[in-house]
């Protein structure tokens, strides 16, 4: 059976296509190619007479067609108007004609696309942004890339207009991009330059650093305030409610106890119109803001009940601290047999009883800090009664 095949089937505009013919009958007078799905003299492209080996252009000939002795038809410099069906009719020597229809599709070489946006400076959690991939072309697939990755599944991302438009609902600061669109057809593909979003947001609740609360007299107080914000926030400081200065950093040299108080950082974004504040308490004191971990020691850790006594000692290098003791999560002393001495550094138990066995630890503290020792285990044993063999000395 007579058939035709397009090589290639998808053709780039400006390129060429060859309509190949298969199973061409042997005894022929000639053949004709037509534009369309049927034989129509008004749409004849070319005819070829085998006897004279002469090609005759038809009404639909554009000058870009070449017919070969094997009936194949070459069309050069194709345009999108060339897309469609082509019919070959062969005139056999028995005066019975045979026909075959083929087709091909011409696609344009795609240009470099560009992204247009309806809002390049959206406000976080408030505005939506619609990106449109330009230009609009027929038979084109539109793809989108965010951060060089294909679109994630998200209810905030919507595609429309044949995927040509990407809409971000309620943008966040993480939606800055970059965004790229890609256009594809069967013969070419092209990607846009990246586009980034300038998402306006904030300020978030400011953070004051460092996190220290306690300072010694004579130290320098240097506080810095930061609030995530776009555009960057404008900062001001208040001490105990009184405005001090409009800077991101606050510096007070050689502080005294009088500098203790509430330090407020105020952050403002003039574009969003939002304000946020954070309050930090500063305490200027001679006391150590950090109490070291105390060490606990026992005169012995295994004792005989109702017979032995034991001394537990809590050691610390810190000054101006207090000490308290704990046994089984309860504060001591808890009985007449327990005594505290030397400013609570020593816990004496005399005598030790079975109920005194267990875990002990001490805690050192001052008004601004505390720390506790590792626990120590006290074991209490009882000796067995003397063995009686039933014999009297004598």
């Amino acid at each position: 059976q007579l058939t035709t095949e397009s090589m290639p089937f998808n053709v780039a505009e400006g390129k060429e296509v060859l309509l190949l013919v298969h199973n061409l009958p042997q005894q022929l007078f000639g053949y004709s190619w037509y534009k369309g799905e049927r034989v129509d003299g008004n749409r004849q492209i070319v005819g070829y007479a085998i006897g004279t080996q002469q090609a005759t252009p038809g009404p639909a000939n554009s000058g870009r067609e070449t017919i070969y002795p094997n009936a194949s038809l070459l069309i050069q410099n194709v345009t999108q108007n060339d897309t469609g069906f082509y019919t070959l009719q062969v005139i056999k020597s028995d005066l019975v004609n045979e026909e075959a229809t083929g087709q091909f599709h011409v696609y344009p070489e795609l240009p470099k696309p560009s992204i247009s946006s309806n809002n390049s400076n959206p406000v976080e959690d408030k505005d939506a942004v619609a990106f449109t991939c330009e230009p609009e072309t027929q038979d084109t697939t539109y793809l989108w890339w965010i951060n060089n990755q294909s679109l994630p599944v998200s209810p905030r991302l919507q595609l429309s207009n044949g995927n040509r438009t990407l809409t971000l609902l309620s943008v966040t600061r993480n939606d800055t991009g970059p965004y790229e669109c890609e256009i594809q057809n069967p013969v070419s593909a092209n990607r846009s330059d990246p586009v980034t979003l300038n998402v306006t947001y904030g300020p978030d609740t400011p953070t004051i650093s460092p996190s220290d609360t306690y300072y010694r007299p004579g130290a320098n107080l240097s506080l810095s305030c930061y609030a995530a914000s776009n555009p960057p926030a404008q900062y001001s400081w208040l001490i105990n409610g009184t405005f001090q200065q409009s800077t991101q950093e606050l510096f007070i040299p050689n502080i005294t106890v009088n500098n203790s108080g509430s330090y407020t950082c105020h952050a403002n974004n003039s574009v969003t119109g939002c304000n946020r504040t954070t309050v930090k308490t500063i305490i200027v004191t001679e006391l150590s803001p950090v109490v070291a971990k105390p060490q606990i020691k026992a005169s012995k850790t295994t004792v005989t009940g109702d017979k032995d006594s034991v001394n537990l000692t809590c050691s610390t290098n810190d000054t101006g601290i207090s000490i308290r003791w704990f046994f089984k999560n309860q504060s001591l002393p808890s009985s007449e047999r327990m005594k505290l001495s030397q400013g609570n550094t020593t816990l004496s138990i005399n005598p030790v009883k079975r109920e005194d066995a267990g875990t002990y630890w001490c805690e050192v503290f001052n008004p601004i800090s505390k720390n506790q020792s590792d626990p120590i285990m006290l074991n209490v044993n009882y000796n067995a009664l003397p063995q009686e063999n039933g014999l009297s000395p004598g």
Partner: antibody, heavy 121, light 111 residues
Framework: EVQLLESGGGLVQPGGSLRLSCAAS????????MSWVRQAPGKGLEWVSV????????YYADSVKGRLTISRDNSKNTLYLQMNSLRAEDTAVYYC??????????????WGQGTLVTVSS | QSVLTQPPSASGTPGQRVTISCSGS????????VSWYQQLPGTAPKLLIY???KRPSGVPDRFSGSKSGTSASLAISGLRSEDEADYYC???????????FGGGTKLTVLG
């Protein structure tokens, strides 16, 4: 069944005009090249003109160039011959004929019964 | 004067084989297909042979065509009385850009 039926012949004075028609049936008219062939009384066959199946290609015999015009209406399955400036030597039976080879191996497989054109004063 | 040359007449008795010749040039017979037509008295011509030697369906195999160089021949074997008619050869002429016929040969079946 293939049928070709000519009409429009008759008596006309020298210099006059006439339009012949050939109604085709029984085949796909638009797929075939068509010709007019004439035969003067007692004489042999003389080819007059051919028109391709789509009407894009037309040829004439030198003896009629500029005076006779061939045309076709594929929607009406009809072939025409417009005859102007007629002469006595144009007197003949005019046949329309079908070429099944689209002109690749010109031949006439079906002929009409003919219509007589007489040019006389 | 016809472009293709045929004998004006030919004759034969029933059952005989008769040959009619047609002579042309390289611009017609030499490079194009030849057809033969039969015209019975008072009727339109009928195609007998096309493409030099091919017979349309319905034409008896008593009729055959051949071609050599710039000449063609029609042979009729087993001649019958109903074969009495005018016979024309025809071919496309590349120089004239037109179809040309021979002057015709009148075949008479004797007896």
């Amino acid at each position: 069944e293939v049928q070709l039926l000519e009409s429009g012949g008759g008596l006309v004075q020298p210099g006059g005009s006439l339009r012949l028609s050939c109604a085709a049936s029984g085949f796909t008219f638009s797929n075939y090249a068509m010709s007019w062939v004439r035969q003067a009384p007692g004489k042999g066959l003389e080819w007059v003109s051919v028109i391709s199946h789509g009407g894009g290609s037309i040829y004439y015999a030198d003896s009629v160039k500029g005076r006779l015009t061939i045309s076709r209406d594929n929607s009406k399955n009809t072939l025409y011959l417009q005859m102007n400036s007629l002469r006595a030597e144009d007197t003949a039976v005019y046949y329309c004929a079908r070429d099944p080879t689209k002109g690749y191996a010109p031949t006439f497989d079906y002929w009409g019964q003919g219509t007589l054109v007489t040019v006389s004063s | 004067q016809s472009v293709l040359t045929q004998p004006p007449s030919a004759s034969g008795t029933p059952g005989q084989r008769v040959t009619i010749s047609c002579s042309g040039s390289s611009s017609n017979i030499g490079n194009n297909y030849v057809s033969w037509y039969q015209q019975l008295p008072g009727t339109a011509p009928k195609l007998l042979i096309y493409a030099d030697s091919k017979r349309p369906s319905g034409v008896p195999d008593r009729f055959s065509g051949s071609k050599s160089g710039t000449s063609a021949s029609l042979a009729i074997s087993g001649l019958r009385s109903e074969d009495e008619a005018d016979y024309y050869c025809g071919a496309w002429d590349q120089s004239l850009n037109g179809y040309v016929f021979g002057g015709g040969t009148k075949l008479t079946v004797l007896g």
